[in-house]
């Protein structure tokens, strides 16, 4: 009982350490921590019935979709699939939990961001953490070597998400991947041209997308006079530079890190240049690095690169940029991501700070790790940050106060006297059984003036009105919502009629 | 009952490095914030270091960031406490300690400790 | 950084005697201070957490008191056993802090 009252006292003032912190304004990442603090101390507290107040609400980094935010999704998503469609992708799908041991060693410092599942039998499982992985065990498992594949689905991050600026902890990832032997850099240009033509497809405004090759970065590091073991934890110091200054990403390498000062003065000198193919020619010419083996390799390969992208028509999107350092392990390659260059805000507003919303590289180690033999399949791929995506298109239809309908519904059976429920139902299933979108509400005398309105509400463009005289006639008088004009259509023609005014094909192939 | 074990200590020269390690047993390990207080010879206490539960928090003493760096494995319920550049004022015997309540920053379960002397 | 002061840095007293020690906090720390026990050649022993509630198994003649930035150890009747170092320490914000220790002697 003692141990009780000094966690609810514990829980009190822990609480009052929060708000405290909350009214001073201290650094999100300390409150986040006495926040989970003071979690932890109310899960050992356990339910006290008398007090226990359910708070009803989705867990921390996730969201609902209303019908309005899945008719957004659904538009986006129709974008990308119809794009790798059109670049002769397949689709798979793979569990939503893999085992622990596939996702283990393949992500770097990020694997602590994996969730694991409570004991599940025996088998020790997590949640994925993007398609990649997946995908680099699946084929392996099939013993595929070549394939050209996307994949939809929500992966799984532990991370501390900033949910306004469209991150989140569950989020679908949209992956398109190609691998196999190919000769260099073709599939590598073709993923960066589906990238350019989807964000260009989504509108959502001007953007980059940053290039790098990790064994330039490699090769960079090594003749810098960074240590092997350091590559990594140094990569993911150098990606902060398109958040933070360099000095910042120095005093990070330098203090936190172990760097030398003057190892690190060096690094700068590379990592805070970009531009285009002359840089890569430049780089060729450097005494230092054109003498690292992998750097050469890599710089070759890039120059190769831009040559596809100038023949893809899309040299003038691409930016080589030295700072990218993509933070996953698995990268071998070239190496990619799209920023949006600005955020289309109404006039006076902060524009929408959301970073990359598309990404990828080259990575042909990973399937080779799952492999009993070692054996490597050259893959490389892109992912589109839908969630950041989905973010931008809402606000911006926000912003324009744009109707976005939530149903397809092409017309509303309604009747305009009473007792004819049953004709409704009758022409309602006759236009079903044709393939037609149709409703009618769900009452036995709607009154005309409701069932127009909610047309009006619903953005349904006709009205297919049975009468007792239309009956008598053989005929639907059909209105426009809009126009408010309406005609008499034969029965047997009002399939067709609704059909060649909504725009459909006239049989359901 | 909870134990807390500690090794890795001993004479290093100045800037040299050294691995402290802590071995917990007796309780889950994975629920606690675990910390490294160290004290030198004849002199008070120092909280030196902490980690959260799942790594995702760690923080240093002025005098150590940088130079230091703290790290655990939950799968083999052992605390780390990686010490470079190591300077005459670090010496001092290093505690391994569990927080109390698993997040509450008071010291409940200590180690027996490890001298590390920087001399040269 | 919060500076614990510890006062008297040293007591002499007699088994049976009641001791208090103070602590001082150079800003407020509601209640998040702690009391610990050294004895020479092992690590410290917590006595007392949020400034008066009791560690279990530790003897009830250990009390605590205070809040903000006065705090007081009182050891209602001295045991033999009780003749150590004591520390305060504050849990309010990091760096987490330690008074310079009293100690305390048999007369």
């Known amino acids: 009982m003692a141990e009780r009252a000094a966690l609810e006292e514990l829980v009190k003032l822990q609480g009052e350490r929060v708000r405290g912190l909350k009214q001073q304004k201290a650094s999100a990442e300390l409150i986040e921590e006495e926040v989970a603090k003071l979690l932890k101390l109310k899960a050992q507290l356990g339910p006290d019935e008398s007090k226990q107040k359910f708070v009803l609400k989705t867990p921390k980094g996730t969201r609902d979709y209303s019908p309005r935010q899945m008719a957004v999704r659904e538009k986006v998503f129709d974008v990308i699939i119809r794009c790798f469609k059109r670049h002769g992708a397949e689709v798979i799908d793979t569990p939503v939990f893999e085992l622990k041991e596939t996702l283990m060693g393949k992500y770097g410092e990020d694997s602590k961001l994996i969730y694991d599942l409570k004991d599940q039998g025996g088998e020790l499982l997590s949640l994925r953490y993007d398609l990649t992985v997946p995908f680099a065990r699946y084929l392996a498992m099939n013993k595929l070597t070549n394939i050209k594949r996307y994949h939809i689905a929500k992966v799984y991050r532990r991370d501390n998400p900033a949910m306004t600026r469209g991150r989140y902890r569950e989020f679908y990832q949209c992956d398109f991947d190609i691998a196999g032997n190919f000769d260099p850099m073709i599939p590598d240009a073709e993923c960066l041209k589906i990238m350019c033509e989807i964000l260009s497809s989504l509108q959502i405004g001007d953007f980059l997308v940053k290039v790098n090759d990790r064994r330039i970065l490699d090769g960079m590091f090594a003749i810098c006079g960074v240590s092997d073991s350091k590559f990594r934890t140094i990569c993911s110091s150098v990606d902060k530079l398109d958040k933070v200054s360099w000095e910042e990403v120095k005093n990070e390498m330098v203090g936190e890190k172990g760097l030398a000062p003057e190892v690190a003065d060096r690094i700068g000198d590379y990592v805070q240049q970009h531009g285009g193919v002359s840089l890569v020619e430049q780089l060729l010419q450097d005494p230092k690095l054109s003498q690292n083996k992998q750097a050469l390799e890599g710089l070759g390969d890039l120059k190769l690169l831009f040559e596809y992208l100038t023949l893809f028509g899309i040299d003038d999107k691409i930016s080589f940029d030295l700072s990218l350092a993509r933070g996953l392990d698995y990268y071998t390659g070239v190496i990619y991501e799209a920023v949006l260059l600005q955020t289309p805000a109404q006039a006076g507003e902060e524009p929408l700070g959301v970073g990359s919303v598309a990404a990828g590289g080259r990575y042909d180690g990973l399937v080779g790790m799952f492999d009993p033999k070692g054996r490597k399949v050259p893959c490389v791929g892109l992912s589109i940050g839908v969630e950041r995506i989905f973010s931008i298109v809402e606000q911006r239809l926000e912003a324009l106060e744009e109707k976005i309908r939530t149903t397809e519904t092409q017309v509303l059976v309604a009747s305009a006297q009473k007792k004819l429920l049953e004709e409704r139902l009758k022409l309602v299933s006759e236009l079903w059984d044709a393939g037609i979108k149709a409703e009618l509400l769900y009452k036995k005398n709607p009154k005309l003036l409701n069932q127009l309105q909610y047309c009006e509400e619903a953005g349904i463009p006709l009205v297919a009105i049975i009468g007792e005289q239309e009956l008598k006639d053989g005929v639907i008088k059909l209105r426009s919502v809009t126009s408010r004009e309406e005609v008499d259509v034969r029965r047997e023609d009002l399939v067709e009629e609704i059909k060649r005014r909504t725009g459909q094909p006239l049989c359901i192939c | 009952q909870v134990q807390l074990v500690e090794s890795g200590g001993g004479l290093v020269k100045p800037g040299g490095s050294l691995r402290l390690s802590c071995a917990a047993s007796?309780?889950?390990?994975?629920?606690?914030?675990m910390s490294w207080i160290r004290q030198a010879p004849g002199k008070g206490l120092e909280w030196v270091s902490y980690?959260?539960?799942?790594?995702?928090?760690?923080n240093y003493t002025d005098s150590v960031r940088g130079r230091f760096t703290i790290s655990r494995d939950n799968a083999k319920n052992s605390l780390y406490l990686q010490m470079n550049s190591l300077r005459a004022e670090d010496t001092a015997v290093y505690y391994c300690?569990?927080?109390?309540?698993?997040?509450?920053?008071?010291?409940?379960?200590w180690g027996q400790g490890t001298l590390v002397t920087v001399s040269s | 950084d919060i500076q614990m002061t510890q006062s008297p840095s040293s007591v002499s007293a007699s088994v049976g005697d009641r001791v208090t020690i103070t602590c001082r906090a150079s800003q407020g720390i509601s209640s998040w201070l702690a009391w610990f026990q050294q004895k020479p050649g092992k690590a410290p022993k917590l006595l007392i957490y949020v400034a008066s509630n009791l560690e279990s198994g530790v003897p009830s003649r250990f009390s605590g008191s205070g809040s903000g930035t006065d705090f007081t150890l009182t050891i209602s009747s001295l045991q033999p056993e009780d003749f150590a170092t004591y520390y305060c320490q504050q849990a309010n914000s990091f760096p987490y802090t330690f008074g310079q220790g009293t100690k305390l002697e048999i007369k």
């Open positions: 300690a569990r927080y109390l309540y698993q997040v509450i920053a008071v010291a409940d379960s």
């Open positions: 980690i959260s539960d799942s790594s995702t928090y760690t």
């Open positions: 007796g309780f889950t390990f994975s629920d606690y914030y």
